[in-house]
Interface confidence: low
């Protein structure tokens, strides 16, 4: 049998912190009681706790957890989301730069094209940011574009001067000209592998940061079970129904019970091991095609080069398109 | 080659960004980041330990508490759970993850597929184009100078001028991060429970 | 109807070269990556090379490098696989396979070949 | 190139449950299972670890715990007495399969 309680003893310094937390003070004994109905804090002798207070420490003891779990990620949470969005904000700086780049190309080196050029332009670096940002966009469908519309307005402009301006019934054949003869040699190929190869890895790099956000969040928010609320209970508010209002759990046992608590979040941790360290991988390579900094900041001269090309073999093609788009032609000059 | 089109940017900011040689790069802010983030490899599995020694735990105190009764901090007892007739800790830990937690790992599983996908050399990823050969060949200097292109005229070196944090609003330190003590924070009474 | 149908086996000698044929049907070929698997008589399945969807990548099993190549024409859905330098342990029933495309948020990846096709007998014999 | 274990056989009665386990796949990459009915070609059977193809009935299953995974049959019906091949990538992303289980149905 568990000795009384002195003849003295109260649940006054019980109550006065019980305050704190449930300022109805109906629920906290006078005197020491058997607790008989206690689930929680099992009694040795008598108790200052009720069944009431049992669950309201158990509650408390659940949002003391959620709120240590936030604080404990808060620094790592902060980390991602801000790399998140600077890393969002400079690709898509590269991507208008490299519009600037390539229009300040056109402007200077070719101004007879520049305001087809520009529209051109425009539209495939804007499908280069949806890309990034996730649009299921073909990178190849996106080159191709851009090289079919310029060709027409390169051939009309450049190569062929006299050829009137609404020269529209020509366009569709120009722009089926354009792939099967190769008027611009390899260099669409080119821009298709490093484009592709550089804003890949660059989407799958944000696509991964997002996640990680996602990941802490998961975490952060979780909701601790019954059973958990229950042994955090007995570890930070068992020990004031025994009127032991100063002592503080021990170390050891504070670990066992965090560690049954958080078995379910910790088996995240090989996962998150291997996702620094894979993303890390990926850092490490993104530099040369790899990178879309160094790929799209180029591309205006690549695409400079490819118009010398068709340039370089304009004689040829003149004539080859002549006969070819002949028909187009004839329908435009009646 | 092209003429190098730096004078043409109408944005003042991008010229200044254009200009300036010592930020950062957005190559550096990337590894910066890993370096960051592998100071968090083991979050996950230090979590019980930083919970409690976040929390209040016996460190200097003779006696402690574990569950049952004041026992001395460096007894046998002291390691016990004390919850041998209300619940078991192991069945706890069989229950496994929440459904939330499986799909996350889920999700982590997958995007590290990708991650080591795209970055083996030959990654076998499916869009088109993303291992054409013959582009990457020759040596093209290092990481600030790289090849882009090439015809007839010979490669082009394009010189990465951009230094990307003059122009970036998010210039915060992780230091200078909200809220950023590592302590609970309490919002209000009803959370802010622990009495020392 | 998701089809897959080889053709081109035969009866060579050692030291041949035969070619496979794979005519692909129901699905738009150029997007999804293509392997061939083989199965000698009484054995297990044994992958013995891949190519991915523009064709630009290839893999191959160490028991085949050097020897076999794969390859693929996406105007004509049709994947091949050219053997040369056949050896008795070659002889198999070939199969090509669809690389199942799984879909995670925007990116694609191998998850597995989720369409067969009936197989194409070579025995490689003198 | 990397190996997936498998056992050689098998055998349950109709209306039972078997497990045939494949381990060794240590590259981190998801496990998929494969049935090959006698004189037909393999067919896809379990991707993902434990994802079904719409047609697969939902008596077959997979798991996957660290470098062995299995799949698991219950109920079992004469009709799937088979071949089973595991299948993942090794490290270089190439396909490895596992050397096959028969199944027999007693």
């Known amino acids: 049998q568990p000795p009384p309680p002195p003849p003295d003893a109260t649940c006054h310094q019980v109550r006065s912190f019980f305050q704190r937390l449930q300022p109805g003070l109906k629920w906290v004994p006078e005197t020491p009681v058997p607790g008989s109905d206690l689930q929680v804090c099992l009694p040795k002798g008598p108790t200052c706790c009720s069944r009431k207070m049992e669950e309201k420490y158990q509650l408390t003891a659940r949002l003391n957890m959620e709120q240590l779990l936030q604080s404990a990620s808060m620094e790592l949470k902060f980390l991602i989301i801000q790399n998140a969005a600077v890393f969002q904000e400079a690709f898509e700086i590269v991507v208008r730069h490299a519009k600037n780049y390539t229009n300040a190309m056109f402007k200077n080196n070719y101004p007879s094209l520049t305001p087809q050029a520009f529209e051109f332009v425009g539209e495939f670096f804007t499908d280069v940011s949806l890309y990034i940002l996730g649009s299921d966009i073909n990178v190849d469908d996106m080159v191709n574009e851009l090289f079919d519309s310029l060709f027409p307005v390169i051939y009309t402009q450049l190569m062929n001067p006299g050829l009137p301006d609404s020269a529209l019934d020509i366009n569709e054949c120009l722009r089926g000209a354009r792939r099967d003869l190769k008027v611009f040699g390899n260099f669409p190929k080119l821009i298709m592998t490093q484009v592709s190869k550089s804003l890949q890895v660059t989407r799958i790099f944000l696509q991964a940061l997002n996640l990680g956000i996602e990941v802490i969040n998961t975490t952060d928010h979780l909701k601790f079970s019954k059973d958990c609320g229950r042994m955090l209970t007995r570890m930070w508010y068992c020990s004031y129904c025994q009127g032991l209002m100063m002592v503080k759990p021990c170390g050891g046992y504070c670990n066992v019970v965090m560690q049954g608590c958080m078995a379910g979040v910790v088996e995240i941790d090989k996962y998150w091991r291997e996702y620094i360290l894979s993303l890390e991988e990926l850092v490490n390579g993104m530099y040369r095609i790899y990178d879309m900094e160094n790929v799209l900041l180029g591309l205006f001269s690549t695409i400079h080069d490819s118009i010398q090309y068709v340039q370089k073999n304009a004689g040829k093609l003149t004539t080859t398109i002549g006969k070819l788009c002949a028909h187009s032609q004839q329908r435009q000059y009646r | 080659s092209a003429y190098y089109p730096e004078d043409l940017f109408i944005d003042k900011k991008v010229l200044k960004v254009a200009h300036v040689e010592h930020e950062e790069t957005l190559s550096s802010r990337r590894r910066e980041l890993i370096q960051k983030l592998k100071s968090f490899i083991s979050f996950y599995s230090a979590l019980p330990g930083y919970i409690c020694s976040h929390s209040p735990v016996a460190e200097n105190d003779t006696l402690c508490w574990n569950g049952q009764e004041l026992v001395e901090r460096y007894s046998q007892k002291a390691a016990r759970n004390g919850m041998k007739n209300q619940f078991n800790l192991h069945e706890l830990k069989m229950k496994g993850p929440e459904p939330v937690v499986s799909q996350i790992i889920d999700k982590l599983k997958h995007i590290n597929q990708l991650l080591r996908t795209m970055s083996m050399p030959k990654g076998r990823v499916l869009d088109k184009n993303l291992d054409e050969e013959g582009f990457e060949s020759g040596d093209c200097g290092d990481d600030e100078d790289e090849c882009i292109g090439g015809s007839g005229d010979g490669m082009i070196k394009v010189k990465n001028q951009l230094r990307f944090l003059a122009e970036l609003a998010y210039d915060l330190d992780v230091d200078d991060a909200p809220g950023n003590s590592q302590q609970a924070t309490p919002k209000d009474n009803e959370i802010s429970t622990f009495h020392n | 109807e998701v089809q897959l149908v080889e053709s081109g086996g035969g009866l060579v000698q050692p030291g041949g070269s035969l070619r496979l044929s794979c005519a692909a049907s129901?699905?738009?070929?150029?997007?999804?990556?293509m392997s061939w698997v083989r199965q000698a008589p009484g054995k297990g399945l044994e992958w013995v090379s891949a190519?991915?969807?523009?064709?630009?990548?290839?893999y191959y099993a160490d028991s085949v490098k050097g020897r076999f190549t794969i390859s693929r024409d996406n105007s004509k859905n049709t994947l091949y696989l050219q053997m040369n330098s056949l050896r008795a342990e070659d002889t198999a029933v070939y199969y090509c396979?669809?690389?199942?495309?799984?879909?995670?948020?925007?990116?694609?990846?191998?998850?597995?070949?989720?369409?067969w096709g009936q197989g194409t007998t070579v025995t490689v014999s003198s | 190139q990397s190996v997936l274990t498998q056992p050689p056989s098998v055998s349950g009665a109709p209306g039972q449950r078997v497990t045939i386990s494949c381990t060794g796949s240590?590259?981190?990459?998801?496990v998929h299972w494969y049935q090959q009915l006698p004189g037909r070609a393999p067919k896809l059977l379990i991707y993902?670890?434990?994802n079904r193809p719409s047609g697969v009935p939902d008596r077959f299953s997979g798991s996957n715990s660290g470098t062995s995974a299995s799949l698991a049959i219950t109920g079992l019906q004469a009709e799937d007495e088979a071949d089973y091949y595991c299948?993942?990538?090794?490290?270089?992303?190439?396909?490895?399969f596992g050397g096959g289980t028969k199944l027999t149905v007693l």
């Open positions: 396979a669809k690389e199942m495309d799984f879909r995670y948020g925007w990116m694609h990846y191998y998850y597995g070949m989720d369409v």
């Open positions: 129901g699905f738009t070929f150029k997007d999804y990556a």
């Open positions: 190519l991915s969807g523009s064709g630009g990548a290839t």
């Open positions: 240590s590259s981190g990459y998801d």
């Open positions: 993902g670890s434990n």
């Open positions: 299948q993942s990538y090794d490290s270089s992303l190439n396909a490895i």
